[in-house]
């Protein structure tokens, strides 16, 4: 039944970039400026997204596809389809409600976005710290202390409920 109805529906013949105009006896009319229809058989065209303010146009709107936005320098996209722009921080910082703040000791951020996260806890894998962590870089784990003495075998201890020192990643 659905298939029969769609064959009789003149609107189903209207391609993307047009809409089925009820005011003009259901003929296919092109989408007006600043609007689009991405699929056929539409009875209206959607308004194009406008990239204003902190948003900038990544892809112009066409009659068949919406505009795409990204963020101006110093900001980055958040959310599906870049629905929000969030301020960048420097490496070694994270964005808080009070602005960009340095990572607290024991955490790092190697990007201009996101949050500071704890240094890897090398001891969880029975390894030792080869290179200390910084605000911008994670620690580098090396061989376990036992591996450095010939003939010694290393056993990885189970993770304790409370782990002082470095946090794992």
């Amino acid at each position: 039944f659905e298939r029969t109805r769609s064959l009789q529906d003149p609107c189903s013949n209207c391609p993307a970039g047009t809409f089925c105009d009820n005011n003009r006896n259901q003929i296919c009319s092109p989408c007006p400026p600043n609007s689009f229809s991405s699929a056929g058989g539409q009875r209206t065209c959607d308004i194009c997204r406008q990239c204003k303010g902190v948003f900038r146009t990544r892809k112009e709107c066409s009659s068949t596809s919406n505009a795409e936005c990204d963020c101006t320098p110093g900001f980055h996209c958040l959310g599906a389809g870049c629905s929000m722009c969030e301020q960048d921080c420097k490496q070694g910082q994270e964005l808080t409600k009070k602005g960009c703040k340095d990572c607290c000791f024991g955490t790092f951020n190697d990007q201009k976005r996101g949050i500071c996260r704890p240094w890897t806890n090398c001891s969880l894998d029975g390894k030792s710290v080869l290179v200390n962590g910084t605000k911008e870089r994670d620690v580098v784990c090396g061989p376990s202390p036992a591996d450095l003495s010939p003939g010694a075998s290393s056993v990885t201890p189970p993770a304790p409920a409370r782990e002082p020192g470095h946090s794992p990643q």
Partner: nanobody, 116 residues
Framework: AVQLVESGGGLVQPGGSLRLSCAAS????????MGWYRQAPGKQRELVAM???????YYVDSVKGRFTISRDNAKIAIDLQTNSLKPEDTAVYYC??????????WGKGTQVTVSS
């Protein structure tokens, strides 16, 4: 000390979803950030998702767009909504609470198995 109790793990088919929960109790003063780590057999424990006190988040690349971490500051609890699960997500998931470099705490872990 801080106690962390995880729940919500289990066996799920590929493409399925689970919601992992973690509640903190005990001597809680200033929890700076909370997160979820996972450890698969024979692999290193890795950070999956973390949320700080401002609500900022971090996700490891392999779960971006599939997992969502949320935090209830009043209850001192976090959830991890895991969607479109894959066999490679199979691991023990540990809740982690970071107060400072010297003070951070672990839950006992909850098993997540993704298999058909």
């Amino acid at each position: 000390a801080v106690q962390l109790v995880e729940s919500g793990g289990g066996l799920v088919q590929p493409g399925g979803s689970l919601r992992l929960s973690c509640a903190a109790s005990g001597s809680i003063f200033s929890i700076n950030r909370m997160g979820w780590y996972r450890q698969a057999p024979g692999k290193q424990r890795e950070l999956v998702a973390m949320i700080n006190s401002s609500g900022g988040t971090y996700y490891v690349d392999s779960v971006k767009g599939r997992f969502t971490i949320s935090r209830d500051n009043a209850k001192i609890a976090i959830d991890l909504q895991t969607n479109s699960l894959k066999p490679e997500d199979t691991a023990v998931y540990y809740c982690h609470c970071w107060v400072s470099h010297e003070m951070n705490y672990w839950g006992k872990g909850t098993q997540v198995t993704v298999s058909s």
